[in-house]
């Protein structure tokens, strides 16, 4: 039950990073135009990824996109790699995630195989809010730059009479959206990978199964022998015969070498 | 069609309050804000402020102590009130719409005149 | 506050001929957002209200003859008519429409020779 726990709600906090990996993405504010200790402008200026826009006081709001590939800084170049790599890996992760959840039956799939695909679509959502906080951090750490070389450049005089304002620009919403969606991606993944581990059985070279027989006697089946225990490539235990002998389906533990009654 | 009325008393006594009021008709104060303008006689025009369509309010600086634009949506009207007022306050007053493009003023009232006199 | 200087105070103009009035600011009305300038021209005709000419420092409001041009960028502007008329008599203003408080020039008084 914990193990179908940990999973699902790995599965929704990944869902939920991912979707705001994509929400950030696609945002325009990730660098807004810096109103402090600045002169009041009747124009808002704000960028993201994609494209810049102006925001008048009218409410009049025009956007143009950065038609240009070759033109483009390759730090922002960069962080849509990181951002598109970080949706794509989550988007895959998603899917077979999907198909792993325990509390879903697909055909006659095995828990070991649950298991791996758990585990990969765990590492995949860890990869996945890394590249989203990397790709956050990094244009964060280039507005911070240029914050700092605009402050140094703001008032440049122009023979002393007339003076030009250079915009700076700050941190936008979309960077606080990537931080926290990254972050709850990688939170995802960790949790399905903890499932994972919940999920697969424990592999050894001796694996026995414990049953009552009818008398005071107690009988041991040592694994290794496949045609006598059901054991061997097998991971899953199977029932013999009826006789008081139990899976670990029924008794939720895993049989290993010290499993002896 | 887009129309901007100006109303209030023609003459105020110093030190007392200017109240006046724009009744629009022809567009929505949701959507569109209104800037307000005085012109002293045979002098060039003054800025006093404006109300965009979200509330916010922008003054002139030298102005700012006195004056306060406000918006009355059920009555489709924008008012002005200046306080204070002194000899120097005298001009024709008006209020024009701010175009949705370009921060420009693209629909004017007639204008009001308004004398400060004891 | 953005100091809007005009010239000249008076321009006498011919009929059919061309007029040209200037404006400087005293700060960029440039926006590097979108490339902009927040510049705004205003006729005032006699006994009249302003009336809105142009915006962005170059586009003519709609309904304004294309004998009204506007140019220029960051400080220095320029609003060109280019065969006057006589009912385009009348004072001429610049406005920066960019920082608060907006501030208008001092005006161009436009008359037939």
């Known amino acids: 039950m914990a193990v179908t726990a940990c999973q699902g709600l790995g599965f929704v906090v990944s869902l939920i990073g991912i979707a705001g990996i994509i929400a950030a993405t696609c945002m325009d504010q990730w660098s807004t135009q810096d109103l402090y200790n600045n002169p009041v402008t009747a124009v808002f200026n704000y960028q993201g990824l994609w494209r810049s826009c102006v925001r008048e006081s009218s409410g009049f709001t025009e956007c143009r996109g950065y038609f240009t590939l070759l033109g483009l800084p390759a730090m922002l170049q960069a962080v849509r790699a990181l951002m598109i790599v970080g949706i794509v890996l989550g988007a895959i992760g998603l899917l077979v995630s999907i198909f792993a959840l325990k509390c879903i039956r697909i055909g006659s799939m095995e828990d070991s195989a649950k298991a791996n695909m758990t585990l990969t679509s765990g590492i995949m959502f860890i990869v996945s809010g890394l590249c989203a906080i990397a790709g956050v951090s990094v244009f964060a750490n280039m507005l911070v730059t240029n914050f700092w070389m605009s402050t140094a450049n703001m008032y440049t005089g122009m023979g002393g009479m007339v003076q030009t304002v250079q915009t700076r620009y700050t941190f936008g919403a979309a960077l606080f959206v990537g931080w926290v969606a990254g972050g709850l991606t990688l939170i995802g993944g960790v949790m399905m990978c903890i499932a994972c581990r919940g999920l697969a059985p424990e592999e050894t070279n001796y694996k026995a199964v414990s049953y009552h027989a009818s008398g005071h006697s107690v009988a041991y089946k040592p694994g290794g022998f496949k045609a006598s225990t059901g054991f061997g490539s097998n991971t899953k235990n199977k029932k013999i015969y009826d006789g008081g002998a139990r899976t670990e389906d029924e008794v939720q533990s895993y049989p290993s070498k010290h499993d002896y009654v | 069609q887009v129309q901007l009325q100006e109303s209030g008393p023609g003459l105020v006594k110093p030190s007392e309050t200017l109240s006046l009021t724009c009744t629009v008709s022809g567009f929505s104060l949701t959507t569109y804000g209104v800037h307000w303008i005085r012109q002293p006689p045979g002098k060039g025009l003054e800025w006093i402020g404006v109300?965009?369509?979200?509330?916010?309010?922008n003054y002139n600086s030298a102005l700012m102590s006195r004056v306060t634009i406000s918006v009355d949506t059920s009555k489709n009207q924008f008012s002005l009130k200046l306080s204070s007022v002194t000899a120097a306050d005298t001009a024709v007053y008006y209020c024009?719409?701010?175009?949705?493009?370009?921060?420009?003023?693209?629909?004017w009232g007639q204008g009001t005149m308004v004398t400060v006199s004891s | 506050d953005i100091v809007m200087t005009q010239s000249p105070l008076s321009l006498p103009v011919t009929p059919g001929e061309p007029a040209s009035i200037s404006c400087k600011s005293s700060?960029?009305?440039?926006?590097?957002?979108?490339?902009?300038?927040?510049l705004t021209w205003y006729l005032q005709k006699p006994g009249q209200s302003p009336q809105l000419l142009i915006y962005?420092?170059?586009t003519g409001e709609s309904g304004v003859p294309d004998r009204f041009s506007g140019s220029g960028s960051g400080t220095d502007f320029t609003l060109k008519i280019s065969r006057v008329e006589a009912e385009d008599v009348g004072v001429y203003y610049c406005q920066n429409a960019y920082f608060y408080p907006f501030t208008f020039g001092g005006g161009t008084k436009v008359e037939i020779k």
């Open positions: 109300i965009w369509a979200g509330g916010s309010t």
């Open positions: 700060q960029t009305l440039l926006n590097s957002g979108n490339q902009k300038n927040y």
């Open positions: 962005w420092a170059s």
């Open positions: 024009a719409r701010a175009a949705y493009y370009g921060n420009g003023l693209d629909y």
